[in-house]
Interface confidence: medium
């Protein structure tokens, strides 16, 4: 049998045999295309492809449609994977979505969607989520059915407002809703009270802004 | 597409009780605040209260409390404001309103508005 | 309660001239956010309020780039810089930083 020598997501590379944390590169789907993408190999079971990373506000979310696109930041760091990448994935098979957060009390929390996927470009990457289980909250701070993904550049949100303008960072957002893990990254003691910052209401309530966020997907069968 | 759709118009007696819906579509009913206005005739806008459409939080006026009572059924998508006590200077134009908001009722601008709903109130 | 003081209460414009409505709150509308929370609505005869600016500034979609909204704290101006006949209508000013929310008296704009 021959060794697989290219990967299209972190379950792939796990089930091969590499099951350290940390940067491995990834080919899209149908392509020979590359990305690198953090793989997470150590919370539940591994194989885990990190999609999205928050942790210190060294890098500026407050991106156009095509940073958010193509990707943006370091793997090793604050990064955003690519909305492209990430669509023709989870267009592919079935992924579950895990996102993990951390506030400045030092409590941790999870949010579990048994099904995600966005939708092409041509649908503004779209989100699509179902079955939501974890300790962030009952309710989806990601506003169902799924919204579409805005940018400062790209307007797309169902508000008369401009929601990325006014809370920062590209997000799907609604009008504007009740989460932007994309927000304005605001430091220990200046997190509360603020709507533009990292936010993922039905786990911290409006206006605090999280220290931490990380947002990963695996396919359903791993 | 968007649009918030209220009942029709009603004459209530002084003392009586009137209850104006509200229905929500175009959108996810559970998102968002909603928020009553009133205006009286040749009077400014008044606010009157609001609330959560996913928890069903409500926050009201001082003016209005304890006359007014502001619900949602959310398999309807239909907000209701009840306003008891009737008086003839509550004879006005009863809107709902969609909040933007940083969620949690913080709302910084009313985006949507209903059609307005005539309540007079004459013995 | 916050009072939200608007001036003149009737403005009669020229098509094409500019125009300017003030408001004025009773105490600071600045958030610690560093937004303004004003926003301005505009009620066409026989329609219910329509969003104009949102947070002193922001122009709402659709909003024509010649309806400007600007000022801090508690001196807020609404200009429309050429009038058109379908910017007829009252004008009313609301805060939205505190419950209740209130609105000013509003101000009413005629084509002369």
């Known amino acids: 049998k021959e060794e697989q020598t290219t990967f299209r997501d972190c379950a792939e590379i796990f089930k091969s045999g590499l099951t350290t944390s940390g940067i491995y590169t990834l080919t899209f789907p149908n392509s020979t295309e590359e990305i690198k993408a953090y793989c997470d190999m150590d919370v539940g079971g591994g194989g885990w492809t990190v999609i999205q990373h928050r942790e210190d506000g060294s890098v500026d979310f407050q991106r156009t449609w095509k940073e958010y696109k193509e990707g943006f930041g370091s793997p090793l760091g604050e990064y955003w994977l690519g909305n492209e990448f990430v669509s023709q994935l989870t267009g592919q098979h079935r992924y579950v979505l895990k996102i993990q957060l951390k506030d400045w009390e030092g409590n941790e929390a999870h949010s579990l969607y048994d099904h995600f996927y966005l939708a092409g470009e041509e649908s503004n990457y779209r989100i699509h989520l179902t079955g939501l289980t974890g300790t962030a909250g009952k309710i989806s701070s990601i506003s169902q059915p799924g919204s579409d993904f805005s940018t400062k550049d790209s307007d797309n949100d169902k508000c008369i407002c401009k929601c990325s303008q006014m809370l920062s960072g590209g997000w799907w957002f609604d009008a504007c809703g009740p989460s932007n893990l994309n927000g304005q990254y605001y430091p220990q003691k200046q997190n509360t009270n603020k709507f533009n910052g990292i936010k993922w209401y039905y786990w911290k309530g409006s206006g605090y802004s999280l220290k931490a966020t990380t947002m990963m997907i695996r396919p359903a069968d791993f | 597409q968007v649009q918030l759709v209220q009942s029709g118009a009603e004459v209530k007696k002084p003392g009586a009780s009137v209850k104006v819906s509200c229905k929500a579509s175009?959108?996810?009913?559970?998102?968002?605040?909603m928020h009553w206005v009133r205006q009286a005739p040749g009077q400014r806008l008044e606010w009157m209260g609001w609330?959560?459409?996913?928890?069903?939080?409500?926050k009201y006026s001082q003016k209005f409390q304890g006359r007014v009572t502001i619900t949602r059924d959310t398999s309807a998508s239909t907000a209701y404001m009840e306003l008891s006590g009737l008086r003839s200077e509550d004879t006005a134009v009863y809107y709902c309103?969609?909040?933007?908001?940083?969620?949690?009722?913080?709302?910084?601008?009313?985006?949507?508005w209903g059609q307005g709903t005539m309540v007079t109130v004459s013995s | 309660d916050i009072v939200m003081t608007q001036s003149p209460l009737s403005l009669p414009v020229t098509p094409g001239e500019p125009a300017s409505i003030s408001c004025r709150s009773s105490?600071?509308?600045?958030?610690?956010?560093?937004?303004?929370?004003l926003d301005w609505y505009l009620q066409k005869p026989g329609q219910s309020p329509q969003l104009l600016i949102y947070?002193?500034?922001n122009r709402a979609s659709g909003v024509p780039d010649r309806f400007t909204g600007s000022g801090s704290a508690t001196d807020f101006t609404l200009r429309i810089s050429r009038v058109e006949a379908e910017d007829v209508g009252v004008y009313y000013c609301?805060?939205?930083?505190?419950?209740?929310?209130?609105f000013g008296g509003g101000t009413k704009v005629e084509i002369k």
């Open positions: 175009g959108y996810t009913f559970t998102s968002y605040a």
């Open positions: 309103a969609r909040g933007v908001d940083d969620y949690g009722g913080n709302s910084w601008a009313f985006d949507i």
């Open positions: 609301m805060q939205a930083l505190q419950t209740p929310l209130t």
């Open positions: 609330i959560n459409a996913g928890n069903g939080n409500t």
């Open positions: 105490q600071s509308l600045l958030h610690s956010n560093g937004y303004n929370y």
């Open positions: 947070l002193g500034s």
